[in-house]
Interface confidence: low
């Protein structure tokens, strides 16, 4: 006869490991007992359990409560055992020795491999600001046995670098994602993907990018200067900018205080019916936590009577 077993048994941390050992004998042969031992190189054999055809299972004190026979129905030629709740320290070489009648003794070895799935963590880098050079966006670390694979899934252009630290029974892998921040990256997902044989599917942690910026400011409302004449109602200036965080707006007049009746409403400066007093240089100040910008315009309120007088003069001069 011969023993049937596996070269390698792979189990995930915390699961039960079935250590197979089946005697395939000739008709009439019997198994008297099966002894299981741990036999790591350089260390003496450590008994796990003894499976006796007559007296049942005896588990050594070191493995009390952790070694069981597989559930029934059981074949008398099957010497397999279950090692409950596998831990990393269980990883190693195991041997089953089978005593048979009348064929004698047989032995076989297997290797137990305990997979330790990683628990990944993602840490965002420093605050991202437009205008920075290559900057750390996020780092992702996963430790497991064997070493996990850490990659990035994103549409954002960037560079990755990885490093690995080996521990006695596991390895930690850290991958960093660097990018040159730009405003177009705002809201884009950056996903750390961790693969490992102990995981049913890849683990993914997503970080949403946030890039601080402040666009140049400009003022709208003066496109047609002829509309800015004495008596006009509803005249307004609007300050245009864009930023993250959203900016706040402030209006001042460069050549004196804001005239009475002028309303500041965030990005908009509203005028009462225009008079020549409203002529001047107006400045829009835009700021957020990242930066500040200014834009200034000159308002020249026209006097229609004055203009028509000038026109008459020009006509008469010709």
């Amino acid at each position: 006869g011969e023993l049937e077993t596996s070269d390698v048994v792979t189990v995930v941390l915390g699961q039960d490991a079935k250590l197979p050992c089946f005697y395939r004998g000739d008709s009439g042969e019997q198994v008297g007992q099966v002894a299981w031992a741990r036999v790591d190189a350089g260390e003496g054999a450590q008994e796990l359990a003894l499976l006796h055809s007559k007296y049942g299972l005896h588990v050594s004190p070191a493995y009390e409560g952790r070694v069981e026979q597989p559930p029934p129905p059981r074949n008398p030629l099957d010497g397999s055992v279950l090692l409950r709740n596998a831990v990393q320290a269980d990883e190693g070489e195991y041997e089953c020795r089978v005593s048979t009648f009348p064929a004698g003794s047989f032995q076989a070895r297997l290797r137990l491999r305990v997979l330790v799935p990683p628990l990944p963590s993602l840490n965002p880098g420093p605050a991202l600001e437009e205008g920075q050079g290559l900057t750390l966006a996020a780092s992702c670390t996963a430790e497991g046995s064997p070493a996990p694979s850490v990659t990035w899934d994103t549409e954002v252009k960037g560079t990755t670098s990885s490093r690995s630290f080996k521990h006695s029974r596991s390895a930690a892998v850290t991958s960093e994602f660097h990018l040159v921040p730009s405003r177009s990256m705002n809201g884009q997902p950056l996903t750390c993907v961790v693969s490992h044989p102990g995981l049913l599917q890849d683990q993914r942690i997503t970080h949403i990018l946030h890039v601080s910026f402040l666009a140049e400011a400009s003022v709208r409302g003066l496109e047609d200067q002829n509309l800015w004449h004495i008596g006009r109602e509803g005249a307004m200036l609007k300050c245009l900018s864009e930023g993250q965080p959203p900016p706040s707006y402030n209006w001042t007049r460069l050549d004196g205080p804001l005239p009475s009746g002028v309303r500041v409403d965030g990005d908009t400066l509203g005028f009462p019916p225009l008079t020549t007093e409203h002529s001047g240089i107006y400045v829009c100040h835009v700021s957020n936590e990242f930066s500040s910008r200014d834009s200034q315009v000159t308002v020249d309120v026209l006097d229609p009577q004055e203009d028509s007088g000038k026109q008459v003069d020009l006509v008469s001069a010709s």
Partner: antibody, heavy 117, light 106 residues
Framework: QVQLQESGPGLVKPSETLSLTCTVS????????VHWVRQPPGKGLEWIGV???????NYNPSLKSRVTISRDTSKNQVSLKLSSVTAADTAVYYC???????????WGQGTLVTVSS | DIQMTQSPSSLSASVGDTVTITCRAS??????LAWYQQKQGKAPKLLVY???NLADGVPSRFSGSGSGTDFTLKINSLQPEDFATYYC????????FGGGTKVEIK
């Protein structure tokens, strides 16, 4: 003011594909994500997935094998397809908008989809 | 996935009371937490984002606090329009919501 409006059939047969459309009006979707969130009757909220302004998508791992989110930028519409539906997929389906993070500042009013033969 | 445990699942209070709702994450989510209010038959409404920031137009009687794993939504001087269900939601990776807290009239 940004507004989101879900539309689609209110009744879907088991094993068929649920299809919904979210129409966004009153604002640009640049730098934003449009998400789908569902709520079974009398129960809590479950995030389904998102499509970002760049076109990339992220899905809830528990639904990933059955979900597709796509968009038609010319119509400012985002669509959700959920295949092989069962009664457990009966829910109010919301579309919602987010900025740089996965929190939702604007929501549609929701549409009830019942899975029944 | 990160689990969000919200408590209590329901509470009774009177107008003018101060109400506190807590939310616990199964792992560190830093400040990546939002709070929503949902009224019967309506869509949720964002109240607080990034754990402590009030969303636009939300009355100052609402406040959020906490970071890491433990978070709190506090409503000072409860108003009639505040009777609703409140949900926390993390946005650290795949978003998940808490089970909800129903605030009812005592």
């Amino acid at each position: 003011q940004v507004q989101l409006q879900e539309s689609g059939p209110g009744l879907v047969k088991p094993s068929e594909t649920l299809s919904l459309t979210c129409t966004v009006s009153g604002g640009s979707l640049t730098n934003y994500g449009v998400h789908w969130v569902r709520q079974p009757p009398g129960k809590g909220l479950e995030w389904i997935g998102v499509i970002w302004s760049g076109g990339s998508t992220n899905y809830n791992p528990s639904l990933k094998s059955r979900v597709t989110i796509s968009r038609d930028t010319s119509k400012n519409q985002v669509s959700l397809k959920l295949s092989s539906v069962t009664a457990a997929d009966t829910a109010v389906y919301y579309c919602a908008r987010s900025g740089k993070w996965y929190y939702f500042d604007y929501w549609g009013q929701g549409t009830l989809v019942t899975v029944s033969s | 996935d990160i689990q969000m445990t919200q408590s209590p699942s329901s509470l009774s209070a009177s107008v003018g009371d101060t109400v506190t709702i807590t939310c616990r994450a199964s792992q560190n989510i830093y400040s990546n937490l939002a709070w929503y209010q949902q009224k019967q038959g309506k869509a949720p409404k964002l109240l607080v984002y990034a754990a402590t920031n009030l969303a636009d137009g939300v009355p100052s009687r609402f406040s959020g606090s906490g970071s890491g794993t433990d978070f709190t939504l506090k409503i000072n001087s409860l108003q009639p329009e505040d009777f609703a269900t409140y949900y926390c939601q993390h946005f650290w990776g795949t978003p998940t919501f808490g089970g909800g807290t129903k605030v009812e009239i005592k």
